[in-house]
Structure formats: structure tokens, C-alpha cells
Amino acid sequence: VPDKTVRWCAVSEHEATKCQSFRDHMKSVIPSDGPSVACVKKASYLDCIRAIAANEADAVTLDAGLVYDAYLAPNNLKPVVAEFYGSKEDPQTFYYAVAVVKKDSGFQMNQLRGKKSCHTGLGRSAGWNIPIGLLYCDLPEPRKPLEKAVANFFSGSCAPCADGTDFPQLCQLCPGCGCSTLNQYFGYSGAFKCLKDGAGDVAFVKHSTIFENLANKADRDQYELLCLDNTRKPVDEYKDCHLAQVPSHTVVARSMGGKEDLIWELLNQAQEHFGKDKSKEFQLFSSPHGKDLLFKDSAHGFLKVPPRMDAKMYLGYEYVTAIRNLREGTCPEAPTDECKPVKWCALSHHERLKCDEWSVNSVGKIECVSAETTEDCIAKIMNGEADAMSLDGGFVYIAGKCGLVPVLAENYNKSDNCEDTPEAGYFAIAVVKKSASDLTWDNLKGKKSCHTAVGRTAGWNIPMGLLYNKINHCRFDEFFSEGCAPGSKKDSSLCKLCMGSGLNLCEPNNKEGYYGYTGAFRCLVEKGDVAFVKHQTVPQNTGGKNPDPWAKNLNEKDYELLCLDGTRKPVEEYANCHLARAPNHAVVTRKDKEACVHKILRQQQHLFGSNVTDCSGNFCLFRSETKDLLFRDDTVCLAKLHDRNTYEKYLGEEYVKAVGNLRKCSTSSLLEACTFRRP
């Protein structure tokens, strides 16, 4: 019988008492084969973290700063359940740390030196740790003691709880630096008042502070937020302009064998029976013998943290950067106006080899990081382990939902002004063998399908989106008799046709021979009835253009396109017979890397782009013999996006809507994790 006990860690006598009450009340409402609570008492949160890591306890609820400690080796804990605030309809699990300024003050984030600052309190998250952590490498050296460095950075501050004797500048705007509400500039409202009164130029608070202190929109419009990209935004655009997104209070558990499903089962049942307004005799979110015992008193319930989400992703890049800077106190030696090498994310060993060759030729401008799937790469870019990669539109959508931005677009047509003219897109098509003359768009049910990969534009999102509108369910593996759609569940019929050996079968990378455009076409040639690819795929792999044994004798005339009206047309008539127009592949990165990625990639394409004529004797960025490694092989250049610099603007309303509709069919664990952070 599996042990269904969750050992909860308590950090005080009062918590232990509430834990015992929690245990007893859960016993009374949950069947004997359901989850149960046991209580473990430790002296501190750090002791609880160590106990969970050592398998002496299973769960504890932590503030964001401690979630970071819990994640660090050797603890390796992960977030499993989040408390939420507000209503069930609009649950808030995060708050945003922001920098508020007056509208007419005219400076940006990178011009804070010499300004006057208002903080909620020394050592507090939104008011100190996050802003000072993010500004850490701009502080004058020596950076220790930190208070002295901050005092020398700003021309005056109010940082309640600071030592006014040793660091008088930190108390210049609020004499005495009192550490309670007796100091009018203490806490969130106090820091905002410090700005409002004109004592300071910037207040470091949370996003709700301004709304709680100014009910009138006209008053709020006198203020703006400083964004990390050195722009400003209105105060209600905090989701796109903040210093960090911070989880409020989170249950953590072991990453391996951490009982996360059991913890969720326990807490979900607990909130049903003892949540807000559920029971008089025991209340989960109430602390008669103290404050915030086990859970925050202000919490309204729990939400399960998606399993794909580790602590780094949950806390977010900005928060982790700020806390790491403060804890480790290390800053890059390079001058900040110089671009560091761009860490390119390469999928599996084929891409890694090409990336390595690029790295050698770039003489240090490009470095390479490997991952097994596109989603793993996106996650690495999110958390700073990698910086950039080029993505199909379907993954540009996921990357965008995860906070990344497009920087340059692949262009596939030769033109005089290639780099300045991003194209409208390419065509997603359905290809069949000419010999299968009875096959049309209307009778694909039961046929064998070949897809570039799950989540990609031409191979999945467009054809499956159209199919979904017809069949109104997500069981595509039942619609087709079998197929190869790399990235599907291994036991799915949509992996049956794939050719990868062993663990590589149906993997969404080049270790699976039927992956990508060329792979999906090969799947059609060798096993399938229909392939969902781009309009250039057939000509690129026929007429001897692909020398691989399976392709060298193929003839374009032996293939036809399925049109949505039920007719068929020759391959060259793709403009009048396609499923939809697809946005070109695009390079994505984090917002903070946007300028450097743009600059370095433009330099790199001038050195190694399509202007290089002899690819046998020189490195060519856009060539890999039909394998589309790092970039599509038919890329002519990487083009500026001009104002299409967000994923929505880049992909276009129609495509975003189409992918949005398919979301209910999504198996993307990363998309689930990212929409948890930003619904």
C-alpha cells in the first residue's frame, strides 16, 4: 500500500498546534484510503527545507526568497502548489515589483544614479531586494557593505529599517529610518507617499500599491512605471513593465519522489472542506494563535503548479537575477555597453555540430548550448542558460507566451533589400502522391499522416486547427489510422509511422528521421498518405536536389497538393492551393538581450550569410543539406521586424487566434507552465 501521508513542516509552536489541528480535521473528513497529514516541527524555514531534501518531511509553504533557497543545490526543491489571493474567477498567485515615477520626470531605468529613492524597507522584496539586486552591477565599487554602495548610488533615500547612524543618506528622506508605520514613509503606502510628496524621484513598490493609494484614474495618470528596457509605461501596464514577477507564497517539495500529486490531492481536499468560508471549526487560512501560520491568512485557495515548472521558471529570470546578484555579489568584468557572446540553443547533436562550427568561425561571438527539444531550448532562454534560437511560428507563439520576443525574421525570397523587408510568410500545404488519386482534403479520415512536429505551424497548428474546426475534438490520433508527428506521446498512433531507433523514436529533433519538413516529406515517400509541410519542401527534395538515397530519384511531378475545396493541384500551384499562410520562422530572445542578439546576428549574417558562394570551403550559416539546422536552409537573410516586435504583432491576429483555438488540444507542458505565470 503506498504511503499517502504528507509530512508537513512547522516552524514554531503555534504552527505545530495548527498543523495538529489540520491533521485531525482532515482525518475526520477524508476516507481512510485518502491522503493524511503528519506534522514535523523544525526551528526555522531553512531547517524545514533541509528536512524535506533529506526526506524527513514532505512540504512547507515559503515566501519567494526562500523558494530560491529551497531550489539551490543541495536542496533541489521545486514549487508544487501556489496560494492564490483575490477571487476564484481571477486568482492572483503573483505580484509585480515595480518602479513608480512621476510622469514629467523624464529619466529611465538606466538613469537612476543620482536620483532620490523611496523603499518599502531594507531587505524587503519589492522595495529593496529586487530593485537593488537588478541595479547591483551598476552600484559603485566596493559594493560591500551594500547599504554604503546604495547610499553612494542614489543622491538620497528613504530605506526604513536601515542603520541611520552608519548610513545617514539612506535615511535622508525620512529622518530616523523608523521600521514601523510610525515612519510615514514605511511600507508600500509609505514608499509611494515618499514619491507623491516629492521627497523622492522613484518608489520601489508592488503593482497594486498605486491602485490602493489612488482610487481616481486621473490621479494615477500622473505616474508611470520604469521598464527594464529603458522605456516607460502607464501604471496599469505593469504586466509588461515591471522589475520582477514574484510568487506570493508557495508549497515546495522534493524534485524527485516529492509526492507532488499527493500534496495537491491533500490541499485540494483541504480547501474544499476548510477553505475560505467553508467551516467554522477549522479554517485553513486563519491563524487564531498568531499570523500566517502554515498558510497566509489572506489566501483564498490553492492552485496546482504545472509539473514542467521548476523553481527558476516559477520565480522568473528577473527575480532570480536580482537575488543571485545580491547573494553572490558577482558582476561581469566586461563593460556593460559591450555585447557578451550570444549563447545559441542547438537541438540534439546535428544542430550542436553546426553550432560549434559557427562558434569557431564567429571567433567567440557565438557560444552553443544544447537541449533535446525545442521547448527545453525555450526554457533555457527564459532562465538565462541560453540566449536565442530561430523558431517556427508555432513555437514563436509558445516563446511569446513565455515572455520571449522575436528579433529577426528568416526571409526566403531573394530581393535587393532583403534585410529591411520582412516577408508576409510561406504557405502551409498538404502533399499526397499523385498515384493516390482518390485522396482529397475531405476524405483524410483513416489515412496515414506525416507531420513536421507537434506544435509547429505547417506540420501541425494549421492542418490540425482546420481539422479541429471540422471534427470538434482533439483526438487526432483516432482520426488518422497512424502517422508520425514527432513530439506526440510515444504510445500514440501518431508515433507508429516514425523511424527513429529506440529512445529517439518520435522525438521532436533530428535524431528522428521523419522530423521537420524534409523528414515529414520522407515519411510520405516511404510510408504515409499525406504530409503537412511548407510549399518549398517538394521542390527542395526532388529533381536530385537532395542527394540522400531516399530522395535522389524523386520527381516533383509525382506529387500533388490537396486544396481545401476538395480538389487537387500540381505542386507549383501552391499559391492557389494551400491550407493557410504561415508566418516565417523567427529568432527569439529575452527582452534584455534583444539589442545584442540583433546586433551580433546582423554582423554574423554579413560574414556567413547567403553572400558566401562556396559553402564547401567556407562556413555557411544558412546551409545544412536539407536538414534545416539552426535556420531553414532556404533562408536568404534575417530581416528586421520594424514594429512587429512582439509575438502577437509578428504572428498576426489570425494565426494567434488559430493557435489559441488549438490550445485546448495542446500537449505543451511549457505552454501550460507559462500561462500559469501569465494567464
Partner: nanobody, 117 residues
Framework: QVKLEESGGGLVQPGGSLRLSCAAS????????MAWYRQAPGKQRELVAG???????NYRDSVKGRFTISRDNAKNTMYLQMNSLKPEDTAVYYC???????????WGQGTQVTVSS
Amino acid sequence: QVKLEESGGGLVQPGGSLRLSCAASGSIFSIATMAWYRQAPGKQRELVAGITRSGSTNYRDSVKGRFTISRDNAKNTMYLQMNSLKPEDTAVYYCTDYSSRYYHDYWGQGTQVTVSS
């Protein structure tokens, strides 16, 4: 694709030196980029150093200042001079030439380098 063969490995004490050679069966004059990789037991294969046709070189951070890559197009050979060797340099060392543009994962036998006292 030219055939490549590595040699020059051996057992050496920490602080010692070795020179690895990579001999090509055909001309390497037109090969765009050549490189040395290494693979320690239980670890991923990693790029150590690379050299372009024009002689530009690039090194992984942990070997910068200790290792030097060079190529002699006349002798159709590439070299890796390894000085101040450390125990963590212990691995099988492979050379590659990327020339096919297929980026297939084909590797020779490699040459074993062991740094131990």
C-alpha cells in the same frame, strides 16, 4: 569527406604537455573549419578548440592559454598542443572537419589522454 585519424595521446602527469595530431587522408586545404572535441567518461562530447581555413582559432574557456590549435595544410594535418595539463583534461580526444555540411555524428577512434599523478 576526408578520413581523419587521431594520434599522440598518452598518460601524463599534471602540469605536463602532449601534442595531438589529426592526419587527413586527403587534402584539407579547402576544408572550412576543423576542430578538436573530447569526451570524458559519462559526459557529453564537447568542443575543445577549432580553427578556420584562414587560421582564426577559438577555444573553450577552460583550456584558453593552455592549449593551442594549428593546421598544416601542406601536410594535411591538424594539431593540438596541450600544456599545463590538469586531471580534468582526461578524456578521449577526437578531431572532425564538418566538411560535409550534413553534420552527421561520425567519429573516428579518438586518442586517449590521461592526466594523473
